[in-house]
């Protein structure tokens, strides 16, 4: 080993990573809201739609106050990875009716990937435990029909919207604890 020498600062630190994650999450929330609205305009939903393979909502308004950094980041990363895979699946499985939304779905997937990478970087820099993201609990087969893929899209975008909404609140709260 040579004599002690300083290292130049890298591009970001954990606090900046968290700021960046908040901005990316907000941006993704706006995209998801807009895409969900487009979906409702083009393909009006007949009530709420569910997909068994989607993660259950992690947080409620009542539990926000008791959030801990490791739990929030781990759960958020696992849930967003699931949504990432569902958007991937939707793009592959989408029938002709959903092809008009392909550019928006592609952009959404790319933004999700960026956010996932930022969250993982934050967890690495903090040295928090990183659970391996599971594959979707239910294997994602092709939708039964064109209407099936539309209902799936409603469910995926609706669930992602709710997840990102609590994520923004949770991350903002965590900023005060880092």
């Amino acid at each position: 080993p040579g004599p002690p020498a300083g290292s130049p600062r890298v591009s970001s630190d954990p606090r900046a990573d968290l700021d960046s994650a908040v901005l990316l999450t907000r941006s993704l929330l706006a995209d998801t809201r807009q895409l969900a609205a487009q979906m409702r305009d083009k393909f009006p939903a007949d009530g709420d739609h569910n997909l068994d393979s989607l993660p259950t909502l992690a947080m409620s308004a009542g539990t926000l106050g008791s959030l801990q950094l490791p739990g929030v980041l781990t759960r958020l990363r696992v849930d967003l990875m699931s949504y990432f895979r569902h958007v991937q699946w939707l793009r592959r499985a989408a029938g002709p009716s959903l092809k008009t939304l392909e550019p928006e779905l592609g952009a959404l997937q790319a933004r999700l990937e960026r956010l996932l990478r930022r969250l993982q970087l934050l967890m690495s820099r903090l040295a928090l435990p990183q659970a391996a993201p599971d594959q979707p609990a239910v294997p994602l087969g092709p939708p039964a029909s064109a209407w099936g893929s539309i209902r799936a899209a409603h469910a995926i975008l609706g669930g992602l919207h709710l997840t990102l909404d609590w994520a923004v609140r949770g991350l903002l709260l965590l900023k005060t604890r880092l």
Partner: antibody, heavy 114, light 111 residues
Framework: EVQLLESGGGLVQPGGSLRLSCAAS????????MHWVRQAPGKGLEWVAV????????YYADSVKGRFTISRDNSKNTLYLQMNSLRAEDTAVYYC???????WGQGTLVTVSS | QSVLTQPPSASGTPGQRVTISCSGS?????????VHWYQQLPGTAPKLLIY???ERPSGVPDRFSGSKSGTSASLAISGLRSEDEADYYC???????????FGGGTKLTVL
């Protein structure tokens, strides 16, 4: 400028103990997870242990589990590695590293030999 | 035996482009964990070269680039220079260890 300065290395007999320290400056130490990584002479890098930013999580490589203890004092911006029951195969340069690791110290040599 | 596999050596002439690969398993690269690359010049400490698969820290020339696909990652160095002669290591988080794992290192020789 980020600085990580290791100390405490030296020659020790098999079965002996050493405590390494790493003094950090130039960054918010309490916001970073910290690692110890070692490199045996002429060999590659081997991760040894990690401690989370607040000290609540600690993980160890199988090769040192039960013998080494990682700790930190955020008020002193200092990382520690307590090494017990040292073996010849623990001979290496020990690096203190922060974050991904993003930053590395220059290392301190630990020689275990009779 | 390293958990991440790298070729032990690589070489190229000045100006050339060289690529170093890094392959992993289901508990690290394959599990969507990001890959980081380090450069270790002779007699010095490792230095972060690429993080999060493809991001460059400030001060790292854009001749260095990283990418990841599936269970493997790669580091590309274009416009090779004599000062690039060093050992290069890939690293990724490993869920089975709850810590980072390193590749065995690749010794790059500039001919």
């Amino acid at each position: 400028e980020v600085q990580l300065l290791e100390s405490g290395g030296g020659l020790v007999q098999p079965g002996g103990s050493l405590r390494l320290s790493c003094a950090a400056s130039g960054f918010t130490f309490s916001s970073y997870g910290m690692h110890w990584v070692r490199q045996a002479p002429g060999k590659g890098l081997e991760w040894v242990a990690v401690i989370s930013y607040d000290g609540s999580y600690k993980y160890y490589a199988d090769s040192v589990k039960g013998r080494f203890t990682i700790s930190r004092d955020n008020s002193k911006n200092t990382l520690y590695l307590q090494m017990n029951s040292l073996r010849a195969e623990d001979t290496a340069v020990y690096y203190c590293a922060a974050g991904v690791p993003d930053y590395w110290g220059q290392g301190t040599l630990v020689t275990v030999s009779s | 035996q390293s958990v991440l596999t790298q070729p032990p050596s690589a070489s190229g002439t000045p100006g050339q482009r060289v690529t170093i690969s890094c392959s992993g398993s289901s508990s690290n690269i394959w599990s969507d964990y990001d890959v980081h690359w380090y450069q270790q010049l002779p007699g010095t400490a490792p230095k972060l070269l690429i993080y999060s698969n493809e991001e460059r820290p400030s001060g790292v020339p854009d001749r260095f680039s990283g990418s990841k696909s599936g269970t493997s990652a790669s580091l590309a160095i274009s416009g090779l220079r004599s000062e690039d002669e060093a050992d290069y290591y890939c690293a990724a988080w490993d869920s089975s260890l709850s810590g980072p794992v390193f590749g065995g290192g690749t010794k790059l020789t500039v001919l």
